[in-house]
């Protein structure tokens, strides 16, 4: 099931989601799409990156940290009540079926009458989760090794919901890892 | 060994809906996917969409959206394939296949399910 | 979509003689990833296709050295240099290197 995120009508809402090349700029694809996501690619894309840059986005939706380094977190902009729902956050690592795929469910609230309490971030995070991934024997390893641009060596995310806001800046970086290959 | 089991035919009615299964053995359902494809009378193979039963997240051909609706029981190693709004254009065999990790080509296939639409 | 042409629709050939069925895709079929996820599959009358030949030229187990696929880009070809009774049937080419995946409409190998 989808890990859950808050974020009040008004406020930047933020779903993290992370992985680790394996050299700087040594980097993989990554699309964000609105919905759960499919088998292939994803659906109704917001935001998409690819070896270099963010080659396309749309209004309101940005990655706020360094992606170059893997963090293709991503940030949505003044939420409504509309933006309520899940999003995909996809790994494109090259081959026909290794991408890691992540769904987040983003709840938005009406935003306090009363002021709320100043906090650092405008988001929820997450406490990290081990990841599994399906192993597929020698075939998969032979697949990713033999690119010869790519050498991808862990993929990291935030996962399960933290709802004490005020952890968020320690477990920022706090992601768990997986090794491919 | 790898077996993907299929009813051999179904006879339903127009207008009506029809639920074709795909039973796996011999392998780690959840580790690839399962795709269905259809073959009218005297034609070719046509890719109707495709499972992932890790997560159950689905792809289909647009030309299926709507019609094909892909589900999976892992508890029993199932794949169902469900058809609505039936017309006699939906008479054709459908298989269901697996595909192998490492290239997306399909390495194991049912016999089919022979899917008859008449009234 | 991605179409696959085959060619030709059908062919007649003897027992023992070279056969050679052409596949043509409408963009290249070469992944970002340096892969070519072009397959060939035989289907006997009543039975359901069987995998033959994948990512072009890797013959599946059990296949007979006879057969042998080559190609590259848009342009593949698929090769049986001792055609056996056993070889008769419709040959289909697929791609799934774009979604949605698709198959070429098939070559019928027949006894001239």
């Known amino acids: 099931s989808e890990v859950e995120y808050r974020a009040e009508v008004g406020q930047n809402a933020y779903l993290p989601c992370f992985y680790t090349p394996a050299a700087p700029g040594n980097l993989v694809p990554v699309c964000w799409g609105k919905g759960a996501c499919p088998v292939f690619e994803c659906g109704n894309v917001v935001l998409r990156t690819d070896e270099r840059d963010v080659n396309y986005w749309t209004s309101r939706y940005w990655l706020n940290g360094d992606f170059r380094k893997g963090d293709v977190s991503l940030t949505i902009e003044n939420v409504t009540l509309a933006d309520s729902g899940i999003y995909c956050c996809r790994i494109q690592i090259p081959g026909i079926m290794n991408d890691e795929k992540f769904n987040l469910k983003l709840v938005i609230k009406p935003a306090k009458v009363t002021p709320a309490p100043t906090r650092q971030r405008d988001f929820t995070a997450a406490f990290p989760r081990m990841l599994t991934t399906r192993g597929h024997g020698p075939a998969e390893t032979q697949t990713l090794g033999s690119l010869p641009d790519i050498n991808l060596t862990q993929i990291s995310t935030l996962a399960n919901e933290l709802r004490d806001s005020r952890l968020a800046n320690d477990l920022r970086d706090s992601g768990a890892t997986i090794r491919i290959g | 060994q790898v077996q993907l089991q299929q009813p051999g035919a179904e006879l339903v009615r127009p207008g009506t809906s029809v639920k074709l299964s795909c039973k796996a053995s011999?392998?780690?359902?959840?580790?690839?996917?399962m795709h269905w494809v259809n073959q009218r009378p005297g034609q070719g193979l046509e890719w109707i969409g495709v499972?992932?039963?890790?997560?159950?997240?689905?792809d289909y051909n647009q030309k299926f959206k709507g019609k094909a609706t892909l589900t999976v029981d892992t508890s029993s190693s199932t794949a169902y394939m469900q058809l609505s709004s039936l017309t006699s254009e939906d008479s054709a065999v459908y298989y269901c296949?697996?595909?192998?990790?490492?290239?997306?080509?399909?390495?194991?296939w049912g016999q089919g399910t022979t899917l008859t639409v008449s009234s | 979509d991605f179409v696959m042409t085959q060619t030709p629709l059908s062919l007649p050939v003897s027992l023992g003689d070279q056969a050679s069925i052409s596949c043509r895709s409408s963009?290249?079929?070469?992944?970002?990833?340096?892969?070519?996820?072009l397959h060939w599959y035989l289907q006997k009358p009543g039975q359901s296709p069987k995998l033959l030949i994948y990512k072009v030229s890797n013959r599946f187990s059990g296949v007979p050295d006879r057969f042998s696929g080559g190609g590259s880009g848009t342009d593949f070809t698929l090769k049986i240099s001792r055609v056996e009774a056993e070889d008769l049937g419709v040959y289909f080419c697929?791609?799934?290197?774009?979604?949605?995946?698709?198959f070429g409409g098939g070559t019928k190998l027949e006894i001239k």
């Open positions: 296949a697996r595909n192998d990790y490492d290239g997306g080509y399909f390495d194991y």
């Open positions: 963009q290249s079929l070469l992944h970002s990833n340096g892969n070519t996820y």
């Open positions: 697929s791609q799934t290197t774009h979604v949605p995946w698709t």
């Open positions: 011999g392998y780690t359902f959840t580790s690839y996917w």
């Open positions: 499972i992932d039963p890790s997560d159950s997240s689905t």
